[in-house]
Amino acid sequence: VLEVYYTSLRCRCVQESSVFIPRRFIDRIQILPRGNGCPRKEIIVWKKNKSIVCVDPQAEWIQRMMEVLRKRSSSTLPVPVFKRKIP
């Protein structure tokens, strides 16, 4: 599941990892666009063992995975859905 969140909070990620996480262990991916108090885009991966990791948006594997997820969501939904939430 790919989710885009707009929040009014400051940056959520203190540390980012570029270590590959296989899709089989990923529960959902949360994207926090830059702005609203945080100068950078943040990607938060929620794993199936309930742990959470911030992933470097420049990591090649997460870019590939998000592209695949975007293509899939655009082929199943007529219009992309962006959730506006305050976690």
């Epitope: 899709r23 089989r24 794993k47």
Partner: antibody, heavy 123, light 106 residues
Framework: EVQLVESGGGLVKPGGSLKLSCAAS????????MSWVRQTPEKRLEWVAT????????YYPDNVKGRFTISRDNAKNNLYLQMSHLKSEDTAMYYC????????????????WGQGTSVTVSS | DIQMTQSPSSLSASLGGKVTITCKAS??????ITWYQHKPGKGPRLLIH???TLQPGIPSRFSGSGSGRDYSFSISNLEPEDIATYYC????????FGGGTKLEIK
């Protein structure tokens, strides 16, 4: 040559505990995730647990979660499976397997397996 | 949880012939499927990963294909050493094995 040798299996009563071990050689153990998979008497294969290369991440299916614990000792090249509150349905041959996912381009799932150790849960 | 339905559960074929085994997933597994050969007293041997990529050292007689929910595995020019049980495994969402196919030679 990659080698995985399981040990520690045996006969245990329902509700009992058992710890399985897997000795790895022929590859850099600390660079690979590892898994346990079992084969039931009906010859079905079931995934049991996976641990990341450094040991910080573990994953289990719901039917063993809370009863089984996977762990590793990278200094000794050993993988472990601590099983507790054992049930008759845990009777199986238990295999350890190397889980290779170097990147999204190199994701082979479980590429090398041991020969297994047998666990029987019976009163 | 993803279910993997493998068929047939057993089959018999002649030496030199060809067999095909199928696995159907309960949802799209995005080509994340492997195929294993399992012989008694040994651990499973990985033949193919990511639907169709042959492991090093595996003869080209073995092949795999598919997409979405439907996948197949074939062995051509059957040889006596191919007698074994074959399993599929999805690794798109955790792990689920198919029920296995026992191959016998006529």
């Amino acid at each position: 040559e990659v080698q995985l040798v399981e040990s520690g299996g045996g006969l245990v009563k329902p509700g009992g505990s058992l710890k399985l071990s897997c000795a790895a050689s022929g590859f850099t153990f600390s660079s690979y995730a590892m898994s346990w998979v079992r084969q039931t008497p009906e010859k079905r294969l079931e995934w049991v647990a996976t641990i990341s290369d450094g040991g910080s991440d573990t994953y289990y299916p719901d039917n063993v979660k809370g009863r089984f614990t996977i762990s590793r000792d990278n200094a000794k090249n050993n993988l472990y499976l601590q099983m507790s509150h054992l049930k008759s349905e845990d009777t199986a041959m238990y295999y350890c397997a190397r889980d290779y996912y170097g990147s999204s381009y190199e994701d082979y799932a479980m590429d090398y397996w041991g020969q297994g150790t047998s666990v029987t849960v019976s009163s | 949880d993803i279910q993997m339905t493998q068929s047939p559960s057993s089959l018999s074929a002649s030496l030199g012939g060809k067999v095909t085994i199928t696995c159907k997933a309960s949802q799209d597994i995005n080509k994340y499927i492997t195929w294993y050969q399992h012989k008694p007293g040994k651990g499973p041997r990985l033949l193919i990963h990511y639907t169709s990529t042959l492991q090093p050292g595996i003869p080209s007689r073995f092949s795999g294909s598919g997409s979405g929910r439907d996948y197949s595995f074939s062995i051509s020019n059957l040889e006596p050493e191919d007698i074994a049980t074959y399993y599929c495994l999805q690794y798109d969402n955790l792990y689920t094995f198919g029920g296995g196919t026992k191959l016998e030679i006529k």
